[in-house]
């Protein structure tokens, strides 16, 4: 058993039929010695008396808020949560496996630049009685500070018969060094509590591996005289790290016909302009990627050819 | 470059960008099978990293690029030695046309651009690489190339910025 926060405790249980469970001793936080009784949740049934209560925790029915009283007065509470371990693996019932980029990916994180700011998000089908707490650091043995905000519900989607809820959190490395080569990964730890079930999820990454620039901005077309060619120009996204002579991007320009089946013409360039042939009813799209490190491409910025 | 003269920024920029491309093309091609063996006894934690105080940020380069260039040079020599070690020359054999060969030669080329014949910087003591057990090599190759990708990305940014702002 360990303390998650004040008066909230997590009991780690091997979860299998007829498992013996864990013996837990609760102590009433009071100077009083006599006349103390214990109850669980809203029940008035007295579970025991005395300053300590010993219980065998085997299932969710044994978890919940234990309260010690004296003469009708509440002295203290202890909330017991269960963390299940099945076949040596901690349960992951609360969050959905996003399966990207690989199986057992529960947390996904992205950064728009090298400033040390990043966003993580996760998915669940649970709508109520759900709380999240997020901690982060750079490295684990001698951790350096990363400050995370509160997790918030950022999107709701309908998936077949189910509703899916997306939560996200923003974090900022306290002393970020954008130009350095990271040697220790960022660690992100999410505590999830649903009713009386506790689970924890972790992710470890380098900022460089989660970079995804915003799409190029101010995408414009300039027709070239007496030609079907156009000059496409764009700018670095505002959110990208500066100076751009140091934090350089590379770009992919694509000409796409109306039909998805039509052949796409693609040009790669380090410049912020390119000359392409504009076909009728086609659109021109541009996306960006770090020039020197193959992290994710940005989403496309698009304009119609007409 | 040692002693404060300026490197051939544009040449270094071109070669470091080529290094980035090679490091990424070499990465998936380092062995005969998936990385099933997660033996982590020998990791690559002792590789030199370009750290915050090394002056490789735009301001540090403007103030005095020598600290940063020396750090890059140390790293290039270190990785060049690693790519010539039995981790890469031993079994499973890399194909003759593997990008690792070009990557190796380019590391040497860039380090020579930074330190021409007859000039000498203090080079960091290269740890004597004890022979790697063959079963560890795939994992070590994978880790070394991952870490090299990060190193050459920073080096390429340095040379791109230098070529754009510090070239005579």
């Amino acid at each position: 058993i360990w303390e998650l926060k004040k008066d909230v405790y997590v009991v780690e249980l091997d979860w299998y039929p007829d498992a013996p469970g864990e013996m837990v001793v609760l102590t009433c936080d009071t100077p009083e010695e006599d006349g103390i009784t214990w109850t669980l949740d809203q029940s008035s049934e007295v579970l025991g008396s005395g300053k300590t209560l010993t219980i065998q925790v085997k299932e969710f029915g044994d978890a919940g808020q234990y309260t010690c009283h004296k003469g009708g007065e509440v002295l203290s509470h202890s909330l017991l949560l269960l963390h299940k371990k099945e076949d040596g693996i901690w349960s992951t019932d609360i969050l959905k496996d996003q399966k990207e980029p690989k199986n057992k990916t529960f947390l996904r994180c992205e950064a728009k630049n090298y400033s040390g700011r990043f966003t993580c998000w996760w998915l669940t089908t649970i709508s109520t009685d759900l709380t999240f707490s997020v901690k982060s650091s750079r490295g684990s043995s001698d951790p350096q500070g990363v400050t995370c905000g509160a997790a918030t519900l950022s999107a709701e989607r309908v998936r077949g018969d189910n509703k899916e809820y997306e939560y996200s959190v923003e974090c900022q490395e306290d002393s970020a060094c954008p130009a350095a080569e990271e040697s220790l990964p960022i660690e992100v730890m999410v505590d999830a509590v649903h009713k009386l079930k506790y689970e924890n999820y972790t992710s470890s990454f380098f900022i460089r591996d989660i970079i995804k620039p915003d799409p190029p901005k101010n995408l414009q077309l300039k027709p070239l005289k007496n030609s079907r060619q156009v000059e496409v120009s764009w700018e670095y996204p505002d959110t990208w790290s500066t100076p751009h002579s140091y934090f350089s991007l590379t770009f992919c320009v694509q000409v796409q016909g109306k039909s998805k089946r039509e052949k796409k013409d693609r040009v790669f360039t380090d410049k912020t302009s390119a000359t392409v042939i504009c076909r009728k009813n086609a659109s021109i799209s541009v996306r960006a990627q770090d020039r020197y490190y193959s992290s994710s491409w940005s989403e496309w910025a698009s304009v119609p050819c007409s | 470059v040692p002693g404060g003269s300026s490197p051939a920024w544009t040449q270094c920029q071109q070669l470091s960008q080529k290094l980035c491309t090679l490091a990424w093309s070499a990465h998936p091609l380092v062995g005969h099978m998936d990385l099933r063996e997660e033996g982590d006894e020998e990791t690559t934690n002792d590789v030199p990293h370009i750290q915050c105080g090394d002056g490789c940020d735009p301001q540090g380069l403007r103030d005095n690029s020598q600290f940063c260039l020396q750090r890059i040079h140390q790293g290039l020599i270190f990785y060049e030695k690693l790519l010539g070690s039995d981790i890469f020359t031993g079994e499973p054999s890399l194909l003759p046309d593997s990008p690792v060969g070009q990557l190796h030669a380019s590391l040497l080329g860039l380090s020579q651009l930074l330190q021409p014949e007859g000039h000498h910087w203090e080079t960091q003591q290269i740890p004597s690489l004890s022979p790697s057990q063959p079963w560890q090599r795939l994992l070590l190759r994978f880790k070394i190339l991952r870490s090299l990708q990060a190193f050459v990305a920073v080096a390429a940014r340095v040379f791109a910025h230098g070529a754009a702002t510090l070239s005579p």
């Epitope: - | 005969h32 099978m33 099933r36 063996e37 030695k81 010539g84 070690s85 039995d86 020359t89 031993g90 079994e91 499973p92 054999s93 890399l94 003759p96 060969g101 690489l129 022979p131 057990q133 063959p134 079963w135």
Partner: antibody, heavy 115, light 107 residues
Framework: EVQLQQSGPELVKPGAAVKMSCKAS????????IHWVKQKPGQGLEWIGY????????KYNEKFKGKATLTSDKSSSTAYMELSSLTSEDSAVYYC????????WGQGTTLTVSS | DIVMTQSPATLSVTPGDRVSLSCRAS??????LYWYQQKSHESPRLLIK???QSISGIPSRFTGSGSGSDFTLSIDSVEPDDVGVFFC?????????FGGGTKLEIK
């Protein structure tokens, strides 16, 4: 065509030393290891050790430490093995081979130690 | 050291037979196993690398299988030219060790 050409047979007296060679051609000599293997007449194969011609790094079978010394010369793409304090137990065919998975083997050097 | 044990020591077969040669490692070597054939007065020749990967120029009747500590070299339809001694080798860890060999004879 890849070839590992080994030096000719040797007849030496007990207590003496011998240095045999293995000249590589048809590939970049520094790209792969050179292993040395011993085979006594009518018997199995024993690994002696290897040299990395790129950096002259070596790895020996404990059993052959002090007996065999591996060296190489990049300029001539040649690997060498010196065997010292020879006894009749050292009489064998000695093969050089590149990485095991490449199947580049020398033809073998026959060493006879006899007074 | 990893001990490589081959069986049988000698195998006498008729041309056209399918034969299996066994090799056992004293501890797991994953798939870091090589098979060689050595004909009389010749250098060894690599038949199979990494337990089951074929080698260009080697007839397809030679196949390898196994992983961990038990390995098999199979010859689909033995030909008279296949005579010789077959060795397996641990390529997993130092020191590299060879099996004692299986001698293949034609009846």
């Amino acid at each position: 065509e890849v070839q590992l050409q080994q030096s000719g047979p040797e007849l030496v007296k007990p207590g003496a030393a011998v240095k045999m060679s293995c000249k590589a051609s048809g590939y970049t000599f520094t790209r792969y290891l050179i292993h040395w293997v011993k085979q006594k007449p009518g018997q199995g194969l024993e690994w002696i050790g290897y040299i990395n011609p790129y950096n002259d790094g070596t790895k020996y079978n404990e059993k052959f430490k002090g007996k065999a010394t591996l060296t190489s010369d990049k300029s001539s793409s040649t690997a060498y093995m010196e065997l010292s304090s020879l006894t009749s137990e050292d009489s064998a065919v000695y093969y050089c081979t590149s990485n095991w998975d490449l199947d580049y083997w020398g033809q073998g050097t026959t060493l006879t130690v006899s007074s | 050291d990893i001990v490589m044990t081959q069986s049988p020591a000698t195998l006498s077969v008729t041309p056209g037979d399918r034969v299996s040669l066994s090799c056992r490692a004293s501890q797991s070597i994953s798939d870091y196993l090589y098979w060689y054939q050595q004909k009389s007065h010749e250098s060894p020749r690599l038949l199979i690398k990494f337990a089951s990967q074929s080698i260009s120029g080697i007839p397809s009747r030679f196949t390898g299988s196994g992983s961990g500590s038990d390995f098999t070299l199979s010859i689909d339809s033995v030909e008279p030219d296949d005579v010789g001694v077959f060795f397996c080798q641990n390529g997993h860890s130092f020191p590299f060790t060879f099996g004692g060999g299986t001698k293949l004879e034609i009846k």
